[in-house]
């Protein structure tokens, strides 16, 4: 039974997107009063694992020496103190890449684009898939995806971007997946470098002009709403 204890923090190192066969460590950080840590995996018998705290007792380590599809999924952790069990942590989604062959990522009409114009990133898989994800390196919200609404299998997904601005420039990769597990992704596509030239930009300085530090919906190809009735793909914001 969840008590009034504050929830612990759950994270993965080196990250939550792990290639098949690589090692990953899941950390759960509670309080100095913690006596035991428990890790639960969604749709698996609880507890998935238990660990004694590491000194000074405020965290525990859960090791996965070699990433496989069995480890992909959603995790939460708890800690037990003398007064009972804590609230659950926020969920950690551990994703495995390398489950399917890599898709191809291209830019239409070209990866060289002028500010103020549009570009469409096209992710194509050899076999039909129902989820396509686009990742921009160093973006604040790197995961965007198109998912089939009715199990319709697709060989490709289009990610439209407009108007293109300087913050769209950078390196993109895409993944494909099957809807039965959102946590199993293909190998990443080869990187695509999008280069934005600024010939359409207003040359006058603006008093509010600043460097954009967050890559958000405007400089991502998707928005958190909407659907694609003709292709059967639905947009999701991750």
């Amino acid at each position: 039974q969840a008590g009034p204890l504050p929830k612990p923090t759950l994270w993965a190192e080196p990250g939550s997107v792990i290639s098949w066969g690589n090692s990953v460590t899941i950390w759960c950080q509670g309080t100095l009063e913690a006596r035991e840590y428990r890790l639960d995996k969604e749709e698996s018998p609880a507890p998935w694992d238990r660990q004694n705290p590491l000194e000074p007792k405020n965290k525990a380590r859960f090791s996965i020496p070699s990433m496989t599809e069995d480890y992909a999924g959603r995790y939460r952790c708890y800690y037990r103190s003398p007064v009972g069990w804590s609230q659950p942590s926020d969920p950690l989604e551990l994703v495995m890449t390398g489950a399917y062959s890599k898709p191809t990522l291209s830019a239409l009409p070209s990866p060289l684009v002028t500010s103020g114009k549009s570009v469409t990133l096209l992710c194509q898989s050899r076999s039909p898939m129902d989820t396509f994800l686009l990742i921009k390196e160093r973006a604040a919200h790197p995961l965007l995806h198109l998912r089939s609404e009715h199990g319709a299998q697709q060989h490709q997904a289009e990610f439209p971007m407009s108007p293109v601005t300087s913050v769209h420039g950078g390196t993109y990769r895409c993944f494909s997946s099957h809807g039965f597990s959102h946590y199993l992704l293909s190998h990443p596509s080869d990187p695509l470098e999008l280069i934005v030239s600024g010939s359409l930009e207003d040359p006058r300085p603006s008093p509010t002009r600043s460097v954009s530090t967050a890559a958000g919906p405007e400089d991502q190809p998707l928005m958190p709403t909407g659907s694609v009735p003709h292709s059967g793909l639905r947009r999701h914001w991750e």
Epitope: S162, P163, T165, G198, E201, R209, V211, S212, E218, S231
Partner: antibody, heavy 118, light 107 residues
Framework: EVQLVESGGGLVQPGGSRKLSCAAS????????VHWVRQAPEKGLEWVAY????????HYADTVKGRFTISRDIPKNTLFLQMTSLRSEDTAMYYC???????????WGQGTSVTVSS | DIQMTQSTSSLSASLGDRVSISCRAS??????LNWYQQKPDGAVKLLIY???RLHSGVPSRFSGSGSGTDYSLTISNLDQEDIATYFC?????????FGGGTKLELK
């Protein structure tokens, strides 16, 4: 719920100035580009200006270039349109609209009316 | 600039009808075509973006199609609340431009 509320409209003399504001709420203002669009009485919609999320990209319609300035105050979640050297043909309902990032404007304000007349 | 043309400025239809509104661009806009609804009170709403993608909360009776320079909006089962003016807009290149609008009226 996404909300955009324009203000600052009114009657202005030809050659005069006016500053419109658009207060945004219900979303993270700092990560969306925003547009101004206008509609003259009994006419269609006309795109006026765009400012990107970080204000580092700005575009204007040729009809307002050099006279209008779009800007934003991110801490205050507010978009502005400074209009100078106003002409009778600038008489319109002015709307602010959020840029979807996909070439569309996905949420619009209710508009504020500007009348340029002597 | 890209010119957008809605050849029909007004259209009369009955409740329950299937209605199509067309829009033509002066050059290929690569599917960056959006449809908006403007009610008599002036309120504007996005219906369809990127030719055929339904915006959040928009009834499924609205659909869009087209490619290149020719696009259309279809309302499959006209409802009383659909009586409005419909505008197409290209989002391919700034300056973004709108069609002149098609006013939908009841017969």
């Amino acid at each position: 719920e996404v909300q955009l509320v324009e203000s600052g409209g009114g009657l202005v003399q030809p050659g005069g100035s006016r500053k419109l504001s658009c207060a945004a709420s219900g979303f993270t203002f700092s990560v969306f580009g925003v547009h101004w669009v206008r509609q003259a009485p009994e006419k269609g919609l006309e795109w006026v200006a765009y400012i990107s999320s970080g204000s580092n990209t700005i575009h204007y319609a040729d009809t307002v270039k050099g006279r209008f300035t779009i800007s934003r105050d991110i801490p205050k979640n507010t978009l502005f349109l400074q209009m100078t050297s106003l002409r009778s043909e600038d008489t319109a309902m002015y709307y602010c609209a959020r840029s979807s990032g996909t070439g569309a404007m996905d949420y619009w304000g209710q508009g504020t009316s500007v009348t340029v007349s002597s | 600039d890209i010119q957008m043309t809605q050849s029909t400025s007004s259209l009369s239809a009955s409740l329950g009808d299937r209605v199509s509104i067309s829009c033509r661009a002066s050059q290929d806009i690569s599917n960056y075509l959006n449809w908006y609804q403007q009610k008599p009170d002036g309120a504007v709403k996005l219906l369809i973006y990127y030719t055929s993608r339904l915006h959040s909360g928009v009834p499924s009776r609205f659909s869009g199609s087209g490619s290149g320079t020719d696009y259309s909006l279809t309302i499959s089962n006209l409802d009383q609340e659909d009586i409005a003016t419909y505008f197409c807009q290209q989002g391919n290149t700034l300056p973004w431009t709108f069609g002149g609008g098609t006013k939908l009226e009841l017969k």
